[in-house]
Amino acid sequence: SERCDDWGLDTMRQIQVFEDEPARIKCPLFEHFLKFNYSTAHSAGLTLIWYWTRQDRDLEEPINFRLPENRISKEKDVLWFRPTLLNDTGNYTCMLRNTTYCSKVAFPLEVVQKDSCFNSPMKLPVHKLYIEYGIQRITCPNVDGYFPSSVKPTITWYMGCYKIQNFNNVIPEGMNLSFLIALISNNGNYTCVVTYPENGRTFHLTRTLTVKVVGSPKNAVPPVIHSPNDHVVYEKEPGEELLIPCTVYFSFLMDSRNEVWWTIDGKKPDDITIDVTINESISHSRTEDETRTQILSIKKVTSEDLKRSYVCHARSAKGEVAKAAKVKQKVPAPRYTVE
Amino acid sequence: DGCKDIFMKNEILSASQPFAFNCTFPPITSGEVSVTWYKNSSKIPVSKIIQSRIHQDETWILFLPMEWGDSGVYQCVIKGRDSCHRIHVNLTVFEKHWCDTSIGGLPNLSDEYKQILHLGKDDSLTCHLHFPKSCVLGPIKWYKDCNEIKGERFTVLETRLLVSNVSAEDRGNYACQAILTHSGKQYEVLNGITVSITERAGYGGSVPKIIYPKNHSIEVQLGTTLIVDCNVTDTKDNTNLRCWRVNNTLVDDYYDESKRIREGVETHVSFREHNLYTVNITFLEVKMEDYGLPFMCHAGVSTAYIILQLPAPDFR
């Protein structure tokens, strides 16, 4: 057959679906690889073809769309499983072609099992809620397109293994779960089970996400430099090791990039000739406030080094701060001689 | 080296003309990343010196021009703060096959682009020229079967060749040619396009078409009631869901508590070859939080949005 633009195995989309549940998988060609959508391709006379390679096999084979009850079907650019089976796991390929054009991409699909408490190898999305911030909601994810708007599904929410009923500050509201006032105790895995009818059958969609309660923007402050500070003087003799920690506290800020860096005489350590090493450690509080420590180290400090200006800088979305370390050369103790 | 291979892209190109490939992979390159190009697993990056025949220009790799020996696999490494991804681009360079009519004619490029003209319509072909900002492209000339296109049915507008009243004779091998200027030097770019003609069809395709809205804004006063229709044409036998969503959630679910914004009951009118569906969204009272938010009408795989905006202040 003629050449086909092969985008290879798109491992960015590690698609995981639960066993014995419906799954709808869009061909990634139109999402990420081609400059046109399915509608344009279809009206231009291009055909979308699906095939797959079973787990631990090399053989590409067509997908059987003639299974009982149309268990696997295709609709436009979507491959449907109603429902999935464990042995549907494998690499799926969608190929768009006509007699003169061809483009294809493969992606892995993993059908996973869950236990009665919804534990599974599924990678869970994380939803962050601000602590004590007023009403916040999470929405049952990835259920669009499974049933028409005329169908009213039943939705049951669970925290871990427990059905959410009469919880103090967590209220199920259909597809949404409302947290009246989020607390650390609300951290955990939340599952929505959506049940809907289709052609005389009942299907379940299970979606689990991790809720993490984080610092509120109401309490967020610019970075705070705990060290260096005015109370500590780094007094060294030439030849000794100079160690200056820069310890900075960052309030949790959604999507903020927290940065800490040293300058020596106004230059980044990489841009000067002295032998400096910098080691960084990071720790987080329960609400994801961050403490970063960067230790500046000069193994054998010279008297020149002790005259330099050492400044720790920190930056977050809330602002930028800097603090100079007090460094001085130790004056040798006077030596008394007895006449 | 800890880099994740994403995919392999195959490109077949003609020698002796410029070529550029942009290293973009939307889920990754939208963030703050650095991009570096390498050839054939070499540890030495492609030069960034603009005088080099092959060099990296921002996220692009640029060949000025492409030569036969440039065939091979090029890697683009995308490094983020905590990630590393690699894209492989397999370039196959072939020598041009010149037109039979004259040695100085145009190369008969067969496999580069496929485009379609629709019989009986006023239609257009596009000259795809993908180059970084440092490359300045001159006016485009169009050729069919190696002859420059002349005639009243054809007009060149920007990167388009406009074709009036498409006929079956318009099928064939086209080429678009432009002069590319980079750092004061000029190069010829020539793309071959194989054009096929499609017959007139009935109502177009089985993908729903959203007639209204058209991704636009609507001016509306705070506190007013607003009803917006979503009009969709689709095939008679379609199974597509039509609905309004906000923040990727059905409006009825999103406003489940307040019921301030609701989706209406769908109606449809039947035509001979298709159905016209209408499903509206009702804002009982427009609030400040509604402004600037895309309210999406979905119809199967098609989407279109409206955005509410405050009317311009009246300074009378």
Partner: antibody, heavy 118, light 107 residues
Framework: EVQLVESGGGLVQPGRSLRLSCTAS????????IHWVRQSPGKGLEWVSV????????GYADSVKGRFTISRDNAKNSLYLQMNSLRAEDTALYYC???????????WGQGTLVTVSS | EIVLTQSPATLSLSPGERATLSCRAS??????LAWYQQKPGQAPRLLIY???NRATDIPARFSGSGSGTDFTLTISSLEPEDFAVYYC?????????FGGGTKVEIK
Amino acid sequence: EVQLVESGGGLVQPGRSLRLSCTASGFTFDDYAIHWVRQSPGKGLEWVSVISWNSDVIGYADSVKGRFTISRDNAKNSLYLQMNSLRAEDTALYYCAKGYNWNFFDYWGQGTLVTVSS
Amino acid sequence: EIVLTQSPATLSLSPGERATLSCRASQSVSSYLAWYQQKPGQAPRLLIYNAANRATDIPARFSGSGSGTDFTLTISSLEPEDFAVYYCQQRSNWPLTFGGGTKVEIK
């Protein structure tokens, strides 16, 4: 008989929006590019915008770029012009016109008057 | 953009006389030029397209010539219904542009 009928004009304040419509009959609407052309009172003609049969090619005059949006609905044989951030200089009679050889105009509507004034 | 300059601005002639209208382009538009006639209170009407082709139902007394930058519309013998404003228009480049018009009035 080919007919183009414009509607939606009227008096509007500067900065406000207006949406013009044009309904076509008597020819195969989705074979042709359709244009909007305007004429200020007592002045000459100014081309405003074009849209191809399948909405794939769209063009605007510099004076309206970013403010006006052209669209069409082949199922309804209709052409639209969404005009936002209107200015006094947009005051004109707006015609829709069928494209001939793409960018000539062989049939015109009777026009709809847009007046932008405070 | 391509500027089209029409001359004269006004042409005063009697019925039966020959009218010659000129349109000059600021750069070559090949043969991609049209002529339109507009009467008060009416929409324009296509007379000539691609410099020299008469549109459907246009009488033979209207003819067009020229290419590149200089174009002429000729009305061989003016009829009473020909007194109107005439515009030229180019389709060689976007934006499409019109000339300022020539008014043919009864002397």
